[in-house]
């Protein structure tokens, strides 16, 4: 058992048929010595007497809200969740594997630029009674400050049956050197809290490797005279590390046709502007991607031939 | 070149030898997303290896100030890389092809490595440690964590000879 | 085409040491390995060790206890494995194979034991 | 050492039927999750082994009745049909870690 906040518990079980579970020492916080009684949840039925309680943990019907009382009035609660753990792996029933880039993926991070400021998000079919919490470090052994605001519900989204809910959390290196090549990992921890049961769900990184830009900005085209072919041009997006001589992105054009199957042409250049032929009712799209290190690209941003 | 008096590398010339090298360190070892490198009992095997870190001066403002500490540190770096890709942990088993990408990766560190030091002039440069691995997995493991760690440094050298060509070349 | 000739059968005393060869014809030496594996009478297949020419890696099996030498002579394309302080157990057919042991982007551990000499049969006998 | 477990010791099947041979690896034979370094070796009675499934590859020449499967620690050679010319002894063998091991072998026959 271990201490999640203040009077709230983690209790850390095996979980399979028959399992004897843990023992649970409850210690009410007061000086008063007799005449204590001790209450779970809503009930009324009094669960033992004296300034300890002993309770065998097994089941979610063990955890929950124990109060302590004398004459009526509250003494202390302790809140106990249940942190599952079945055939040595701990539960991971609150948040749904989003399998990308690999299975057993919970926890998906961003970054637009190399300041030290990500976006991490994770998905859910759990509505209500959910809480989460967000820690985050560089590197684990001697960790330094990264700082996570609160999650949000950030999306909702009606799959098949289910809806499914989207949180997400914006973190900040407190002291980030954009230039330096990173030695140590960025740690995320998520706790997850779902009625009575608690899970944690973790993901390392490098700010290099979830790297993606903003898609390209002011997209624009200039027809060459006498000509089929175009000029297009655009300007690296605002969100993108400065000074762009030192954090360059490189670019991909693409012409797209109005039919999904008719042949893409497609261009790479490190420029900002591209001469192509452009089509009757093709679009044209821009995407970006650092220069030197091969992290996701953009967005297309696009615009209509005509 | 950069030479012990502190004068200008040749900024345009490695600028695009170190974009070769980023090329080259991608077609070596590309993101392999189903590989769980974790797996393997995963030791830092490659916490050793040179980083350009924040006092390196290879920031733009850095290399405004004063370009040497920071190419220092990337000569560094590109020796100790091309020390490691000439070891027995890129020519001992599984053999690497011949027209594998990490020979030219490893010819390419040495060229932009003497641009940035003409002979008779030694910056110090780092030991190498000895990392034999007495099974052949392992060798492939620490190959796939040296050509991800290459990739991150090469980045970071390329970064500094393109603000270099663009603002600092004469 | 691919071949590794074996040297022919040997009848040694216990406590004595054989050397069996393999020459290799048919392809580059130097690109692959050799391999010795064992079967004694009726038994099993059993790995002794491989040596790569190329990176002069050599690899045993300790169970060997340094009782056996592999080695190679890149000059006539000859592979060796020396076994000393034999026994009556060490009675066996001994086999090169060559071994190619690879890694490409596609195929970062490809291992295989693709062609195999004829057999040598050591009988270890007082 | 790793030790590989053959089973069964031998197996008798008709032709045109479906055999199943087993290996367990005393530890992990995969790396990194997904790249196998298990293979089998077909050995018929006075003739050298002869490699028919690399890791998770079946050998150039050998045909597709022969299928391998499994990661981690259990692996599975299967053919699909029998034939008369697949009647000899199988074995698996390990090259993630030195010393190489084989399984102890498995025979089949014609029932």
């Known amino acids: 058992i271990w201490e999640l906040k203040k009077d709230v518990y983690v209790v850390e079980l095996d979980w399979y048929p028959d399992a004897p579970g843990e023992m649970v020492v409850l210690t009410c916080d007061t000086p008063e010595e007799d005449g204590i009684t001790w209450t779970l949840d809503q009930s009324s039925e009094v669960l033992g007497s004296g300034k300890t309680l002993t309770i065998q943990v097994k089941e979610f019907g063990d955890a929950g809200q124990y109060t302590c009382h004398k004459g009526g009035e509250v003494l202390s609660h302790s809140l106990l969740l249940l942190h599952k753990k079945e055939d040595g792996i701990w539960s991971t029933d609150i948040l749904k594997d989003q399998k990308e880039p690999k299975n057993k993926t919970f926890l998906r991070c961003e970054a637009k630029n190399y300041s030290g400021r990500f976006t991490c998000w994770w998905l859910t079919t759990i509505s209500t009674d959910l809480t989460f919490s967000v820690k985050s470090s560089r590197g684990s052994s001697d960790p330094q400050g990264v700082t996570c605001g609160a999650a949000t519900l950030s999306a909702e989204r009606v799959r098949g049956d289910n809806k499914e809910y989207e949180y997400s959390v914006e973190c900040q290196e407190d002291s980030a050197c954009p230039a330096a090549e990173e030695s140590l990992p960025i740690e995320v921890m998520v706790d997850a809290v779902h009625k009575l049961k608690y899970e944690n769900y973790t993901s390392s990184f490098f700010i290099r490797d979830i790297i993606k830009p903003d898609p390209p900005k002011n997209l624009q085209l200039k027809p060459l005279k006498n000509s089929r072919q175009v000029e297009v041009s655009w300007e690296y997006p605002d969100t993108w590390s400065t000074p762009h001589s030192y954090f360059s992105l490189t670019f991909c054009v693409q012409v797209q046709g109005k039919s999904k199957r008719e042949k893409k042409d497609r261009v790479f250049t490190d420029k900002t502007s591209a001469t192509v032929i452009c089509r009757k009712n093709a679009s044209i799209s821009v995407r970006a991607q650092d220069r030197y290190y091969s992290s996701s690209w953009s967005e297309w941003a696009s615009v209509p031939c005509s | 070149r950069a030479v012990p008096g502190g004068s200008s590398p040749a900024w345009t010339q490695c600028q695009q030898l170190s974009q070769k090298l980023c090329t080259l360190a991608w077609s070596a070892h590309p993101l392999v997303g189903h590989m769980d490198l974790r797996e393997e009992g995963d030791e830092e095997t490659t916490n050793d290896v040179p980083h350009i870190q924040c006092g390196d001066g290879c920031d733009p403002q850095g290399l405004r100030d004063n370009s040497q500490f920071c190419l220092q540190r990337i000569h560094q770096g590109l020796i100790f890389y091309e020390k490691l890709l000439g070891s027995d942990i890129f020519t001992g088993e599984p053999s690497l092809l011949p027209d594998s990408p990490v020979g030219q990766l490893h010819a390419s560190l040495l060229g932009l490595s003497q641009l940035l030091q003409p002979e008779g002039h030694h910056w110090e440069t780092q030991q190498i440690p000895s990392l034999s691995p007495s099974q052949p997995w392992q060798r492939l493991l620490l190959r796939f964590k040296i050509l991800r760690s290459l990739q991150a440094f090469v980045a970071v050298a390329a970064r500094v000879f393109a603000h270099g060509a663009a603002t600092l070349s004469p | 085409q691919v071949q590794l000739v074996q040297s022919g059968a040997e009848v040694k005393k216990p406590g004595s040491s054989v050397k069996v060869s393999c020459k290799a014809s048919?392809?580059?030496?130097?690109?692959?390995?050799i391999t010795w594996v064992r079967q004694a009478p009726g038994q099993g297949l059993e790995w002794m060790g491989e040596n790569y020419p190329r990176s002069g890696n050599t690899y045993y099996n300790e169970k060997f206890k340094g009782r056996v030498t592999i080695t190679a002579d890149k000059s006539t394309s000859t592979a060796y494995m020396e076994l000393s302080s034999l026994r009556s157990e060490d009675t066996a057919v001994y086999y090169c194979?060559?071994?190619?042991?690879?890694?490409?982007?596609?195929?970062?551990?490809?291992?295989?034991?693709?062609?195999w000499g004829q057999g040598t049969l050591v009988t270890v006998s007082s | 050492d790793i030790v590989m477990t053959q089973s069964p010791d031998s197996l008798a099947v008709s032709l045109g039927e479906r055999a199943t041979i087993n290996c367990k690896a005393s530890k992990k034979v995969t790396i990194f999750g997904s790249i196998s370094a298990l293979h089998w070796y077909q050995q018929k009675p006075g003739q050298p082994p002869k490699l028919i499934y690399n890791g998770a590859k079946l050998e150039s020449g050998v045909p597709d009745r022969f299928s391998g499967s499994g990661s981690g620690t259990d692996f599975t050679l299967t053919i699909s049909s029998l034939q008369a010319e697949d009647v000899a002894v199988y074995y698996c063998l390990q090259n993630k870690e030195v010393p190489y091991t084989f399984g102890g072998g498995t025979k089949v026959e014609i029932k």
């Open positions: 048919g392809y580059t030496f130097t690109s692959y390995g």
């Open positions: 194979a060559r071994a190619e042991f690879i890694s490409t982007v596609v195929a970062p551990y490809y291992y295989a034991l693709d062609y």
